[in-house]
Interface confidence: medium
């Protein structure tokens, strides 16, 4: 009995269950490509269990096999609009360190307002997660529109 | 050795692994923009392990961080058919209780037959999740086609 | 103290956590629409924690269910290349063993450039999963455009 | 890396037709695709057309589809650029390139690990 309680009480980090899901809070200034991220309840759905938010940018806390998943939904938008504005591409990758720099997930809008992507891969402890989005259309900011979020896996 | 017997006989339900995987059963009526899911293993592919259905919509049964996803698939569609119906708009939602009742993931076909996305979200015992379906189209109800699921993840 | 030593040193394969993560390799001779594909950390960031390949195709080694996602990019493509040249379509299914055959996803490009999608589906040992690309059309081989996974869910 | 060399180039006037030829020497074990470039004065160079070593699926450049068309004879390590209704603004430089990617992007260059060294083609009255 006491055993299972100390089980009970162990803290869910501990088992490596770190997930994060945000919503987008802004874009960049004119030269800057990437998406600023934000979370918590206060917010609305969003949250963080592990990860953190650096300057907008999502940074890993665990080393692990993570399913990274996201959608944007482009503001205003119609087939014509997102066709007229080609190239229009979404990449997410690891910005730093610098090292460890490599585009992870890649989608172009071509005649869609909307992408949305998810994949398995390996992240480490510090990893920080960039999304970038070329061109010059602007993302909605409806939570249920667009979104950016992580879960981990495996070791 | 008691114990590791013990351990083994604990249902896994027990353990929070809710999951269910849902195929397209019918539309609503006229003004009931709402699909209606079936699942079970007489179907085919499609389960509930926790989860249950309630006319036609899932609800869930554990409090918990889960991975909803979804793919619908126009029926007798083209780029053409989807761009002069536009806009028709899948989303998905809690839409009961009334007092939890929110869109949760939100897309539109424009000149694509299939809309499929994916992200984690709290839910709620009790929470019962919508599909809804604005427009005239109709979604074909191939198993590989369209089909509508949510994944516990995390407490 | 001993008992949670013992604990650490399970594999991970016996908690049930198999995943994978593949690369396109090369697709297939003339009337062959399959995507054959290849993994391992010697060739960037694609992996296989328990399944296996074989002759490109993804084989399963532990009953249960797993969530199946893919993206597929096409190569020097446009809206009017997708157009042009459909139908194309990119179908997941179990090719092997014959008794088990059966489209699992199943997406059309229409207008556009990328597929992606996913799918919680029962999968046994010895499964071997398929990918088939219909038309003439060249998927790109890039790691952030074109990837193929599954993650073990639960029993 | 392979051994690319390029040939079939020449002056043509508008409206006519040429092939290109390029012959592959060396390991194509690990090669994706092959695929034809152009650079034309003044500009980046550009995809035209790639089709697959394995399979000969092919994708197309907007510009040249339904004028162009590429090929390839395995027997003879021979990937083929067939080019009808030429205008004069497919005056380029034509590079023949083996890929182990193949981007989703026209403008992609990246990896294309070997290039041959080029053929002209000028389309003029």
């Known amino acids: 009995q006491r055993f299972a309680q100390a089980q009970q009480q162990l803290p869910l980090e501990s088992l490596g269950w770190d997930v994060a899901e945000l919503q987008l809070n802004h874009t960049g200034p004119q030269q800057d490509p990437r998406l600023y991220w934000q979370g918590g309840p206060a917010l609305g759905r969003s949250f963080l269990h592990g990860p953190e938010l650096d300057k907008g940018q999502l940074r890993i806390h665990r080393d692990g096999i993570y399913m990274v998943h996201i959608q944007v939904t482009l503001a205003i938008c119609s087939s014509t609009t997102a066709s007229r504005h080609h190239p229009t591409t979404l990449a997410v990758g690891i910005c730093s360190p610098a090292s460890r720099s490599i585009s992870l997930l890649r989608l172009s809008f071509h005649q869609g307002c909307t992408i949305a992507s998810q994949r398995l891969t390996p992240l480490a402890r510090g990893d920080t997660l960039c999304t970038n989005l070329t061109g010059t259309l602007l993302p909605s900011r409806n939570t249920d529109e667009t979104f950016f979020g992580v879960q981990w896996v495996r070791p | 050795q008691r114990f590791a017997q013990a351990q083994q006989q604990l249902p896994l339900e027990s353990l929070g692994w809710d999951v269910a995987e849902l195929q397209l059963n019918h539309t609503g009526p006229q003004q009931d923009p709402r699909l209606y899911w079936q699942g079970g293993p007489a179907l085919g592919r499609s389960f509930l392990h926790g989860p249950e259905l309630d006319k036609g919509q899932l609800r869930i049964h554990r409090d918990g961080i889960y991975m909803v996803h979804i793919q619908v698939t126009l029926a007798i569609c083209s780029s053409t058919t989807a761009s002069r119906h536009h806009p028709t708009t899948l989303a998905v939602g809690i839409c009961s209780p009334a007092s939890r009742s929110i869109s949760l993931l939100r897309l539109s076909f424009h000149q694509g037959c299939t809309i499929a996305s994916q992200r984690l979200t709290p839910l709620a015992r009790g929470d019962t999740l919508c599909t809804n379906l604005t427009g005239t189209l109709l979604p074909s109800r191939n198993t590989d086609e369209t089909f509508f699921g949510v994944q516990w993840v995390r407490p | 103290q001993r008992f949670a030593q013992a604990q650490q040193q399970l594999p991970l394969e016996s908690l049930g956590w198999d995943v994978a993560e593949l690369q396109l390799n090369h697709t297939g001779p003339q009337q062959d629409p399959r995507l054959y594909w290849q993994g391992g950390p010697a060739l960037g960031r694609s992996f296989l924690h328990g399944p296996e390949l074989d002759k490109g195709q993804l084989r399963i080694h532990r009953d249960g269910i797993y969530m199946v996602h893919i993206q597929v990019t096409l190569a020097i493509c446009s809206s009017t290349t997708a157009s042009r040249h459909h139908p194309t379509t990119l179908a997941v299914g179990i090719c092997s063993p014959a008794s088990r055959s059966i489209s699992l996803l199943r997406l059309s490009f229409h207008q556009g450039c990328t597929i992606a999608s996913q799918r919680l589906t029962p999968l046994a040992r010895g499964d071997t999963l398929c990918t088939n690309l219909t038309g003439t059309l060249l998927p790109s081989r890039n790691t952030d455009e074109t990837f193929f996974g599954v993650q073990w869910v639960r029993p | 890396q392979l051994q690319l060399v390029e040939s079939g180039g020449g002056l043509v006037q508008p409206g006519g037709s040429l092939r290109l030829s390029c012959a592959v020497s060396g390991r194509t074990s690990s090669t994706y695709a092959m695929a034809w470039f152009r650079q034309a004065p003044g500009k980046e160079r550009e995809i035209v057309a790639v089709i697959t070593w394995s399979g000969g699926r092919t994708a197309y450049a907007d510009s040249v589809k339904g004028r162009f068309t590429i090929a390839k004879d395995s027997a003879k390590n021979t990937v083929y650029l067939q080019m009808n209704s030429l205008k004069p603004e497919d005056t380029a430089v034509y590079y023949c390139?083996?890929?182990?990617?193949?981007?989703?992007?026209?403008?992609?260059?990246?990896?294309?690990?070997?290039w041959g060294q080029g053929t002209q083609v000028t389309v003029s009255s």
């Open positions: 390139a083996a890929d182990s990617e193949v981007s989703s992007s026209s403008e992609g260059q990246y990896g294309y690990e070997s």
